[in-house]
C-alpha cells in the first residue's frame, strides 16, 4: 500500500532509500524539450516474486520539438499519495542492491531523464539520513525512517537526527552509532521490512561507499 | 521472532488503577501500531485503541476514553495500558497486539499472552 | 460504530465436514483508500486470537489453504473446506476500515 505522506524533513539533511520496495513507483519524467514517447509508460514499478525483484515498463522520453512544456505525469487516482521529489544531479546507479528480497535496486537513468525522481513509496519503505556538506550529524538514535500503517492509515517515523553547522562531512547514512540501534524486524514468509541483516547488508554497504557516491540528493 | 511479553495477572480493589505492560521483542515498537483489546470472561473482543510510540499519538474507541490510557515507552520497546476508576466491569483478559504489514499483508499477526485484571469490591 | 453481525452464534461440524461462517456489517467497510479491512481471528480456548485471513480473501503466513475468505460491500464469509481438531475455536470477523474498528460477537466452531 501506499504511504500518504513524504518522508520527514530534516534540517540540513538528505534522505536515501537504499533499495525500493515491491510497489514502489517511480514517474516516467523528461526533461525539459523532452516528452514520454506516445503510448509509453506512465511509471515503473518495482515487481517480483520471493526470489527477485525488478522494474517493471521503462521509461523512454522523445523531443517534444513542437511542445516547449514538459508532460506532467499525473498518477492514477489510488496512486496519488506519495509524491518524493528526488534531484538526480548525474544519474547512476549505487552499489548492488539486489541482496535485500523484495526489494529493487535503483533504476538506471534513461535517456533525457528529467533532472528530478518522483517515487511513489509503499509501506515498509525505509529511507536514510545524512547531513549535507559543512553539517555534522548529531545522533539521538538511528538516522532512519519508516512509512509504517495501522488499517489504512499511513505515517513516516520522525528519525533521531540533528545536523549541525560544523565543518564536517559525515559518512551515510551516518558516522556516529546511534545510541540504540534499529532491532532486527520480525521476519516471515513475505515480510516487507529489512531484517537485521538486510540492515547490516546496507550498513555494511554503506559504509564502504564513499560520501560522493551519492549523487543523488533527496531533497 | 516477533514477540509480546504482557505483565502478570492482577488483583485490584473497585475505584483504583492498574497499569500493564507488553514488552515488545524481536521488533521495534515505533515502527508499528501497538492495539490492546479487551476480552472480559466468556465475552467476545473490544478494540480499545492503538499508539504510535514513535510520538505518543492515540486513538481511543469512545467507550474507553477516560477508562483507558494508552502510553509507549521507546527506550524499554514496551507499551503501557492504564486503566483508571475500575470496576467490576473492568474485569477482563487485555491483549497487546501489533498490526503488522508485509508486501501484501497485514493484520493483527502478533498478540501478548494477555493479562487478567481482576476487581474486587 | 460499525456493527459487524455474525452468524451463526455456534456451529456443530464433524470432522471433514465443509464449515461457513457468515459476517455482516452495518455498513459498506471500504476504507477511503479502496481497500476492505476485513480480517478473521481465530482464537482457541486459553490462547491469544491469530490472524488467518487480511483484506477479506487473503490468507496470512502459514495458515492452512483449507480456510478461505470470500464477499464485498457488507456481506463477509469465512469457509474451512474439512474442518480438522485443531480448528476448533471462535472466530471473529474484524474491521479496520472505520474508526473504532469493531468486532464481531464470534462464531464458536465445535464438533457435533
Known amino acids: 500500500e501506499l504511504c500518504d505522506d513524504d518522508p520527514p524533513e530534516i534540517p540540513h539533511a538528505t534522505f536515501k532509500a537504499m533499495a525500493y520496495k515491491e510497489g514502489t513507483m517511480l514517474n516516467c519524467e523528461c526533461k525539459r524539450g523532452f516528452r514520454r514517447i506516445k503510448s509509453g509508460s506512465l511509471y515503473m514499478l518495482c515487481t517480483g516474486n520471493s526470489s527477485h525483484s525488478s522494474w517493471d515498463n521503462q521509461c523512454q522520453c522523445t523531443s517534444s520539438a513542437t511542445r516547449n512544456t514538459t508532460k506532467q505525469v499525473t498518477p492514477q487516482p489510488e496512486e496519488q499519495k506519495e509524491r518524493k521529489t528526488t534531484e538526480m544531479q548525474s544519474p547512476m546507479q549505487p552499489v548492488d542492491q539486489a541482496s535485500l528480497p523484495g526489494h529493487c535496486r535503483e533504476p538506471p537513468p534513461w535517456e533525457n531523464e528529467a533532472t528530478e525522481r518522483i517515487y511513489h513509496f509503499v509501506v515498509g519503505q525505509m529511507v536514510y539520513y545524512q547531513c549535507v556538506q559543512g553539517y555534522r550529524a548529531l545522533h539521538r538514535g538511528p538516522a532512519e525512517s519508516v512509512c509504517k500503517m495501522t488499517h489504512g492509515k499511513t505515517r513516516w517515523t520522525q528519525p533521531q537526527l540533528i545536523c549541525t553547522g560544523e565543518m564536517e562531512t559525515s559518512q551515510f547514512p551516518g558516522e556516529e552509532k546511534p545510541q540504540a540501534s534499529p532491532e532486527g524486524r520480525p521476519e516471515s514468509e513475505t515480510s516487507c521490512l529489512v531484517t537485521t541483516t538486510d540492515f547490516q547488508i546496507q550498513t555494511e554497504m554503506a559504509a564502504t561507499m564513499e560520501t560522493s557516491i551519492f549523487t543523488t540528493e533527496y531533497q | 521472532q516477533a514477540y509480546l511479553q504482557q505483565s502478570g495477572a492482577e488483583l485490584v480493589r473497585s475505584g483504583a488503577s492498574v497499569k500493564l505492560s507488553c514488552t515488545a521483542s524481536?521488533?521495534?515498537?515505533?515502527?508499528?501500531?501497538i492495539h490492546w483489546v479487551k476480552q472480559r470472561p466468556e465475552q467476545g473482543l473490544e478494540w480499545i485503541g492503538w499508539i504510535d510510540p514513535d510520538n505518543g499519538e492515540t486513538e481511543y474507541a469512545p467507550k474507553f476514553q477516560g477508562k483507558a490510557t494508552m502510553t509507549a515507552d521507546t527506550s524499554s520497546n514496551t507499551a503501557h495500558l492504564q486503566l483508571s476508576s475500575l470496576t467490576s466491569e473492568d474485569t477482563a483478559v487485555y491483549y497487546c497486539?501489533?498490526?503488522?504489514?508485509?508486501?501484501?499483508?497485514?493484520?493483527?499477526?502478533?498478540w501478548g499472552q494477555g493479562t487478567l485484571v481482576t476487581v474486587s469490591a | 460504530d460499525v456493527v459487524l453481525t455474525q452468524t451463526p452464534l455456534s456451529l456443530p461440524v464433524s470432522l471433514g465436514d465443509q464449515a461457513s461462517i457468515s459476517c455482516r456489517s452495518s455498513?459498506?467497510?471500504?476504507?477511503?483508500?479502496?481497500?476492505?479491512?476485513l480480517e478473521w481471528y481465530l482464537q482457541k480456548p486459553g490462547q491469544s486470537p491469530k490472524l488467518l485471513i487480511y483484506k477479506v480473501s487473503n490468507r496470512f503466513s502459514g495458515v492452512p489453504d483449507r480456510f478461505s475468505g470470500s464477499g464485498s460491500g457488507t456481506d463477509f464469509t469465512l469457509k474451512i473446506s474439512k474442518v480438522e481438531a485443531e480448528d476448533l475455536g471462535v472466530y471473529y470477523c474484524?474491521?479496520?476500515?472505520?474508526?473504532?474498528?469493531?468486532f464481531g460477537g464470534g462464531t464458536k466452531l465445535e464438533i457435533k
Open positions: 455498513q459498506s467497510i471500504v476504507h477511503s483508500n479502496g481497500n476492505t479491512y
Open positions: 524481536g521488533f521495534n515498537i515505533k515502527d508499528y501500531y
Open positions: 474484524f474491521q479496520g476500515s472505520h474508526v473504532p474498528p469493531t
Open positions: 497486539t501489533v498490526f503488522w504489514y508485509g508486501n501484501n499483508y497485514a493484520g493483527f499477526a502478533y
